[in-house]
């Protein structure tokens, strides 16, 4: 299992019908984690997608951040996670917004807020034992 | 070098069916996430299928194409497949597969296979 915070750009960016593979494990004593695809490589990069599973408080937001501001949050329905358990974790990008699908059915449309095309770099952070991330 | 041959299209009435396949061979081809995407003409680039080998395989699929199109993987022969059922006009595309690669590789893409489903 690699080391979180995970970080990898994305040169060539992503654009519809692009998905991103994520797994790992949640920690027995996990708080929350994120993915986020981030618009930049530096500190304070809007994000398209900020993907928060909350094992604290038992719910999982996505929301998006441009220019230092989070925007509405929005929630999905339950909490696919568990501590102590593996996941995977798909995120589909289409031209009208990102599909996380967890497990094997889809979890969430979560509709574009920010151009896709300006999407940079993926991070993975917060309590979990990272195993990797693919794209394709 | 990753290289990925897709077969298995072709002309197809609607309600008909066909199989899809896909092998893929060179170094770093044992992948474990595999999937089928398609592009009709003048169309973005769509997600149909992927299968992911996780504690057992974990299998996804398009909602347009839940029920009718199942994926699989022959790992003997690095192959992955896509069993299309209940084809419609709207499947017409061709049909690319792809193996999952670290970001920054973007994954590994085959050449197309033609679908067309028309009566």
């Known amino acids: 299992m690699s080391n979180v915070p995970h970080k990898s750009s994305l040169p060539e960016g992503i654009r519809p019908g692009t998905v991103l593979r994520i797994r790992g494990l949640v920690p027995p004593n996990a708080s929350r984690f994120h993915v986020n695809l981030l618009c930049g490589e530096e500190q304070g990069s809007d994000a398209a997608l900020h993907f928060n599973p909350r094992l604290d408080t038992s719910e999982v937001v996505f929301n998006s951040k441009e220019q230092g501001s989070w925007g509405r949050e929005e929630r999905g329905p339950g909490v696919p996670f568990q501590r102590g358990q593996p996941f995977e974790v798909l995120i589909i990008a289409s031209d009208d917004g990102f599909k996380a699908v967890v497990g094997d059915a889809q979890y969430h449309h979560f509709r574009h807020r920010l151009p896709l095309a300006r999407v940079r770099l993926v991070e993975v952070g917060g309590d979990v034992q990272l195993d990797s991330v693919r794209i394709f | 070098e990753v290289q990925l041959q897709a077969s298995g299209g072709g002309f197809v009435q609607p309600g008909g069916s066909l199989r899809l396949s896909c092998a893929a061979s060179?170094?770093?081809?044992?992948?474990?996430?595999m999937g089928w995407f398609r592009q009709a003409p003048g169309k973005e680039r769509e997600f149909v299928s992927a299968?992911?080998?996780?504690?057992?395989?974990?299998?996804y699929y398009a909602d347009s194409v839940k029920g009718r199109f199942t994926i699989s993987r022959d790992n003997s022969k690095n192959t992955v497949y896509l069993q299309m059922n209940s084809l419609r006009a709207e499947d017409t595309a061709t049909y690319y597969c792809?193996?999952?690669?670290?970001?920054?590789?973007?994954?590994?893409w085959g050449q197309g296979t033609q679908v067309t489903v028309s009566s």
């Open positions: 792809a193996l999952g690669g670290a970001p920054g590789q973007t994954g590994y």
């Open positions: 060179g170094a770093g081809s044992r992948s474990d996430v």
């Open positions: 299968i992911s080998g996780f504690w057992g395989w974990t299998t």
